[in-house]
Amino acid sequence: MMTGTIETTGNISAEKGGSIILQCHLSSTTAQVTQVNWEQQDQLLAICNADLGWHISPSFKDRVAPGPGLGLTLQSLTVNDTGEYFCIYHTYPDGTYTGRIFLEVLESSVAEHGARFQIP
């Protein structure tokens, strides 16, 4: 039985040209994490495999950095990076857990404007 749950950073926004950390955390299970895939819609960004380490997809090598932990850092953000991101945890013996993050990349002025109205 799959008892685990994935906590994610949820819906996040970031400034064009900046960077963002995509983070997921698997809890409430003793299953062993064998691999974590990071995907954007149907496109593979990166894999963190327990035995082989990190593999970054060639098309994202310049803009994606591993970590912290099993998370992923996206750099030099563009408006085209707006969209859904998925962390897919492959575990044994439970199977697969998936978390979803929605990233909105904002024009610099919009991001700055929005920041003024954030509730502390």
């Epitope: 691999q35 894999i47 495999n49 327990a50 035995d51 082989l52 380490g53 990190w54 593999h55 970054i56 591993p66 970590g67």
Partner: antibody, heavy 119, light 107 residues
Framework: QVQLVESGGGLVQPGRSLRLSCAAS????????MHWVRQAPGKGLEWVSG????????GYADSVKGRFTISRDNAKNSLYLQMNSLRAEDTALYYC????????????WGQGTMVTVSS | DIQLTQSPSSVSASVGDRVTITCRAS??????LAWYQQKPGKAPKLLIY???SLQSGVPSRFSGSGSGTDFTLTISSLQPEDFATYYC?????????FGGGTKVEIK
């Protein structure tokens, strides 16, 4: 005891192909990722390729990408390296190696099989 | 790809000496670094994994330290059987890579 025995090396002409094999014994082969590492005569170690237990993820050194293919047969406790379009610079002793599970250090090595690429 | 730079490339030392070999990674690799010893005509032998964990059966005079980009292998008191070539290897990123090696020779 844990043992890895490589075979399939030999003298081959540039542009030709060769298939290396590694027979594993003394451990549960299907539970482990496996690797190929080579060493040119008088030179240092070069990681060639690695494969997860289920062949779900495979990695290659840039120097062999597109020419070499790693594979495994868990039912036969065997690891393979198919080497195509061989070049003189592929001349080396090829080792099969097993990692410490999840810790990624290579703790068991075979004796190596020599591949010589020459016309 | 991650480049690993070992220094020195060779070192002359005497029995009983303390020997330190460094390995620098071109990018951060956390603690995913291993050290190997290789003697002529022999396969490499794993000494240290995870930057600082001693492999079973390896004498305690060998120790490893570091994280991120800078790592060190130390032989606290060199023994006659320690004259060999030492390699570092990173396993954080694919493709895995080895350092160029450090030859420890008799002075």
């Amino acid at each position: 005891q844990v043992q890895l025995v490589e075979s399939g090396g030999g003298l081959v002409q540039p542009g030709r192909s060769l298939r290396l094999s590694c027979a594993a014994s003394g451990f549960t082969f299907r539970d482990y990722a496996m690797h190929w590492v080579r060493q040119a005569p008088g030179k240092g170690l070069e990681w060639v390729s690695g494969i997860t237990w289920n062949s779900g993820l495979i990695g290659y050194a840039d120097s062999v990408k597109g020419r070499f293919t790693i594979s495994r047969d868990n039912a036969k406790n065997s690891l393979y390296l198919q080497m195509n379009s061989l070049r003189a610079e592929d001349t080396a002793l090829y080792y099969c190696a097993k990692p410490v599970p999840r810790l990624r250090g290579l703790d068991v090595w075979g004796q190596g099989t020599m591949v010589t690429v020459s016309s | 790809d991650i480049q690993l730079t070992q220094s020195p490339s060779s070192v002359s030392a005497s029995v009983g000496d303390r020997v330190t070999i460094t390995c620098r990674a071109s990018q951060g690799i956390s603690s995913w670094l291993a050290w190997y010893q290789q003697k002529p005509g022999k396969a490499p032998k794993l000494l240290i994994y995870g930057a600082s964990s001693l492999q079973s059966g390896v004498p305690s005079r060998f120790s490893g330290s570091g994280s991120g980009t800078d790592f060190t292998l130390t032989i606290s008191s060199l023994q006659p059987e320690d004259f060999a070539t030492y390699y570092c290897q990173q396993a954080f990123y694919l493709p895995w890579t080895f350092g160029g090696g450090t030859k420890v020779e008799i002075k």
